[in-house]
């Protein structure tokens, strides 16, 4: 499916706890509101114009796997995040990894397997 402007749909789903997008082409992920109540977001086998700069205050689990496009990681603001799976995206990540990349100090699980070049230049400060 190709979803060009689906913010109206997202706004209707602001209070669901889990949300999954599979095999979707989507350009406007940064239109997600910080206030959305999602606790678990799954983006699998989707196509993005750029890495989605997610900003979601309630999100605890993010599964972002096997996606195409947006090959450079850019920071997200997910203050409640505990679980992050970024595997199999062909991502390059210059300067992994610090609290400031994810906007959280709560991270317990991080999977960066099967990606591109991951350059480690921080010692997981704030993610201990």
């Amino acid at each position: 499916y190709y979803l060009d402007d689906i913010i109206d749909l997202f706004n209707c789903l602001t209070n669901v706890s889990s949300f999954s997008l599979v095999s979707v082409t989507i350009e406007r992920v940064k239109d997600f509101s910080y206030n959305f109540g999602w606790q678990h977001l799954e983006l699998v086998n989707c196509k993005f114009g750029q890495f989605p700069t997610l900003k979601l205050k309630s999100l605890k689990r993010l599964t972002f796997t096997s996606n195409k496009g947006g090959n450079a990681f850019s920071e997200v603001d997910l203050p409640s995040l505990e679980f992050l799976d970024l595997s199999r995206n062909g991502l390059s990540f210059k300067g992994c990894c610090s609290q400031s990349d994810f906007g959280t100090t709560s991270l317990k699980y991080l999977d960066l397997s099967f990606n591109g070049v991951i350059t480690m230049s921080s010692n997981f400060l704030g993610l201990e």
Epitope: Y34, K55, D77, K94, G95, S100, S121, S122, N123, G126
Partner: antibody, heavy 118, light 107 residues
């Protein structure tokens, strides 16, 4: 507590290069966040100039891209601004700031006034 | 670039009055809008993030609302110490941009 402190000459001649340094205490700049320069001409609003990410990546306001350089010295925990070919319109209070993940600025230096005049 | 237009430019208000400052974006920015207070000869201070989320330590009389293109900063029951210039800033896209500012004066 993170603190930022700008320093540099308060007077620069037209066509010269403006050079400022921001000393950071309370957080190692090589371990996280991005570190920004923002300026404010006297009596006017704020203009974002550019930043250096903790990885060393830099990005700038397109309006300044041909004249601006931002670098860092992690051993001194400081980052620097250079702005070339300055004119009177570059007269401003220059602030350094730390941006959080959500593209906002919780931490600012106190600012330093730079006047461009012969 | 995203242009932020603030209104009014200037407001003269008596203590305990309610102040409303608006910020309009040239395109939709979801809720990626932040507010700052700047007192004379001081650096800006973050008041509100993401349109409506108060920063720790900021008095509860400051509140924000809005989404998309239209945003509001409200100061309920203005106090003398609130005399300052207030700026909005969008974090939706680079280059990051600020509104032109609203100066609030105490009558």
């Amino acid at each position: 507590q993170v603190q930022l402190q700008e320093s540099g000459p308060g007077l620069v001649k037209p066509s010269d290069t403006l050079s400022l340094t921001c000393a950071v205490s309370g957080y190692p700049i090589r371990f996280g966040y991005s570190w920004h320069w923002i300026r404010q001409p006297p009596g006017k609003g704020l203009e974002w100039m550019g930043y250096i990410h903790y990885s060393g990546y830099t990005d700038f306001n397109p309006s300044l891209k041909t004249r601006i350089t931002i670098s860092r010295d992690t051993s001194k925990n400081q980052f620097s601004l250079k702005l070339s070919s300055v004119t009177a319109v570059d007269t401003a209070v220059y602030y350094c700031a730390r941006k959080d993940s959500g593209n906002y600025f919780p931490y600012w230096g106190q600012g330093t006034l730079v006047t461009v005049s012969s | 670039e995203i242009v932020l237009t603030q209104s009014p430019d200037f407001q003269s208000v008596t203590p305990k009055e309610k102040v409303t400052i608006t910020c309009r974006a040239s395109q939709s920015i979801s809720d990626h809008l932040h507010w700052y207070q700047q007192k004379p000869d001081q650096s800006p201070k973050l008041l509100i993030k993401y349109a409506s989320h108060a920063i720790s330590g900021v008095p509860s009389r400051f509140s924000g609302s809005g989404s998309g293109t239209d945003f509001t900063l409200t100061i309920n029951s203005l106090e003398a110490e609130d005399a300052a210039t207030y700026y909005c800033q969008q974090g939706y896209d680079f280059p990051l941009t600020f509104g032109g500012g609203t100066k609030v004066e105490i009558k």
